[in-house]
């Protein structure tokens, strides 16, 4: 569910939600971290609808979800569940 | 008190249509997400479809997907599901019941039901 | 998709029994599950979410429990109003309901 892509891109997100969406109804989460042509980390989420969304980083929310993704591939998967992809 | 009051339920020929209303009250409407589960007669319960507060965002599962289309008009805090090409295994009570709060962050379930509309898909 | 299966399907006990259900999820569901309540002819009620927090006004006597993918839950004592049919719901990955446990008077 949570990946983190390096890429060379600039930024992708022209526009951030902080609207709260149940993990339930989320299908995966894309984390783009700051550097290679944007100033700013992203997070884009893809619901279950196929709709996709850029979700603001600062959002509590969000920010929750992932430390208890986070937790709980630690707990059940032995690799990382950081999914790296170098240019 | 959180009322739900769902209408709109009846006798219908397979293939046909029908609407169903739910009517809020008792809760600041527009800040929920609101949902719509059935049970077919002497059966379990099952999830037909679930909109977000605002309205942007749907979800249904697989075998009412393309058929049944959830909605809300949040300024009559309403909740409808059209219902097309209708099948003899549509026959349930169909439920509305209030989902999780847009504005926070706690992943909570649907919490507050209605007393159910039958709709019967019968030739 | 997740497939709930609850067991059993249905018991027969007295007041004053500890009963016990339980909900097998098909994957794992962290502790994303909710249990509810139905009386014949009436709405289900929510009685407990995340597994073990109970709703506002639901007694103590209700209690759940598990992670992951075993979850149980039980009726410490029963009294005469808790006779009923329970549901378990998984809403980590869109929504399934468990089959249903009927509670009989024994």
């Known amino acids: 569910v949570l990946e983190v892509y390096y890429t060379s891109l600039r930024c992708r997100c022209v526009q951030e939600s902080s609207v709260f969406i149940p993990r339930r109804f989320i299908d995966r989460i894309q984390i783009l971290p700051r550097g290679n042509g944007c100033p700013r980390k992203e997070i884009i989420v893809w619901k279950k609808n196929k709709s996709i969304v850029c979700v603001d980083p600062q959002a509590e929310w969000i920010q929750r979800m992932m430390e208890v993704l986070r937790k709980r591939s630690s707990s059940t998967l032995p690799v990382p569940v950081f999914k790296r992809k170098i240019p | 008190e959180v009322q739900l009051v769902e209408s709109g339920g009846g006798l219908v020929q397979p293939g046909g249509s029908l609407r169903l209303s739910c009517a809020a009250s008792?809760?600041?409407?527009?800040?929920?997400?609101m949902s719509w589960v059935r049970q077919a007669p002497g059966k379990g319960l099952e999830w037909v479809a679930t909109i977000s507060d605002g309205g942007s965002d749907a979800y249904y599962p697989d075998n009412v997907k393309g058929r049944f289309t959830i909605s809300r008009d949040n300024a009559k805090n309403s909740l409808y599901l059209q219902m097309n090409s209708l099948r003899a295994e549509d026959t349930a009570v169909y439920y509305c019941a209030r989902d999780y709060y847009g504005s926070g962050y706690e992943d909570s379930p649907m919490d507050y039901w209605g007393q159910g509309t039958l709709v019967t898909v019968s030739s | 998709d997740i497939q709930m299966t609850q067991s059993p399907s249905s018991l027969s006990a007295s007041v004053g029994d500890r009963v016990t259900i339980t909900c097998k999820a098909s994957q794992d569901i962290n502790k994303y599950i909710a249990w509810y309540q139905q009386k014949p002819g009436k709405a289900p009620k929510l009685l407990i979410h995340?597994?073990?927090t109970l709703q506002p006004g639901i007694p103590s006597r209700f209690s759940g429990s598990g992670s992951g993918t075993d979850f149980t839950f039980t009726i410490s004592s029963l009294q005469p109003e808790d006779f009923a049919t329970y549901y378990c719901l998984q809403y980590d990955n869109l929504y399934t309901f468990g089959g249903g446990t009927k509670l009989e008077i024994k």
């Open positions: 995340y597994t073990s």
């Open positions: 008792g809760f600041t409407f527009s800040s929920y997400a």
